[in-house]
């Protein structure tokens, strides 16, 4: 799978994580920080 950094317009897309662009799948993906979940890393869990 080809990946690259997200475009600058997606700054802030991932609330608590790193935004990765999955080129072949035509979509952005959030790699969440520890303790966060959700499509955009918006949920905190203990």
């Amino acid at each position: 799978v080809s990946i690259t950094k997200c475009n600058s317009d997606m700054n802030g897309y991932c609330l608590h994580g790193q935004c990765i662009y999955l080129v072949d799948m035509s979509q952005n993906y959030c790699r969440c920080e520890v303790g966060y979940t959700g499509v955009r890393c918006e949920h905190f869990y203990l």
Epitope: T4, N7, S8, D9, M10, G12, Y13, L15, Y21, V23, S26, Q27, N28, V39, R40, E42
Partner: antibody, heavy 116, light 106 residues
Framework: QDQLVQSGAEVKKPGASVKVSCKAS????????IQWVRQAPGQGLEWMGR????????KYREKFERRVTITADTSTNTAYMELSSLRSEDTAVYYC?????????WGQGTLVTVSS | DIQMTQSPSSLSASVGDRVTITCKAS??????IAWYQQKPGQAPRLLIQ???TLQPGVPSRFSGSGSGTDYTFTISSLQPEDIATYYC????????FGGGTKVEIK
């Protein structure tokens, strides 16, 4: 199956406002950005602006900044685009477009006609 | 705002010809360019994103290339069903469409 269903065609008088809705099904708009694009008859595509429904943040093309308002109601999974002070040049098909989780998934378009 | 200058605005070619359309951005868009095909009365159809990644179901005669500010869209062998208007779109910093290229059969 993911869908963006837009409201029906509108006819408006110059100076009036129009509000176009875009209802999402099959996905949560909070996971995406919703863009708005328009196309006047026989003309090219023109990006108007977008909303991040999760945060409520909006960005607009400079030429529309004073006249357009993009909103989202996450409880009904619906985005809206309101354009005020309509003039004849605003006659166009208006599209909502999902981006973020999937690159550019388009609604069917809404024709807005501005005529006296 | 980033400006996208697309050329030519129209072209006429024969079936089987190679067709090339270019888009020049006013600043580096880091390969974040997509290409759309639009036929009359239809919504635009995404052909290519991230400069050269073909969407599923799109024929391999369509291709894209480029980097920095200069990008190219190519139809290697024009077919009658390719008659349409083609648009580039930069999506690095917000979004801007090129002016479009109307492709006709000679």
């Amino acid at each position: 199956q993911d869908q963006l269903v837009q409201s029906g065609a509108e006819v408006k008088k110059p100076g009036a406002s129009v509000k176009v809705s875009c209802k999402a099904s099959g996905f949560n708009i909070k996971d995406t950005y919703i863009q708005w694009v328009r196309q006047a008859p026989g003309q090219g595509l023109e990006w108007m602006g977008r909303i991040d429904p999760l945060r409520g943040n909006t960005k607009y093309r400079e030429k529309f900044e004073r006249r357009v308002t993009i909103t989202a109601d996450t409880s009904t999974n619906t985005a809206y685009m309101e354009l005020s002070s309509l003039r004849s040049e605003d006659t166009a098909v208006y599209y909502c477009v999902r981006s973020g989780t999937l690159f550019d998934f388009w609604g069917q378009g809404t024709l807005v006609t501005v005529s006296s | 705002d980033i400006q996208m200058t697309q050329s030519p605005s129209s072209l006429s070619a024969s079936v089987g010809d190679r067709v090339t359309i270019t888009c020049k951005a006013s600043q580096d868009i880091h390969k974040y360019i997509a290409w759309y095909q639009q036929k009359p009365g239809q919504a635009p159809r995404l052909l290519i994103q991230y400069t050269s990644t073909l969407q599923p179901g799109v024929p391999s005669r369509f291709s894209g290339s480029g980097s920095g500010t200069d990008y190219t869209f190519t139809i290697s062998s024009l077919q009658p069903e390719d008659i349409a208007t083609y648009y580039c779109l930069q999506y690095d910093n917000l979004r801007t469409f090129g002016g479009g290229t109307k492709v006709e059969i000679k």
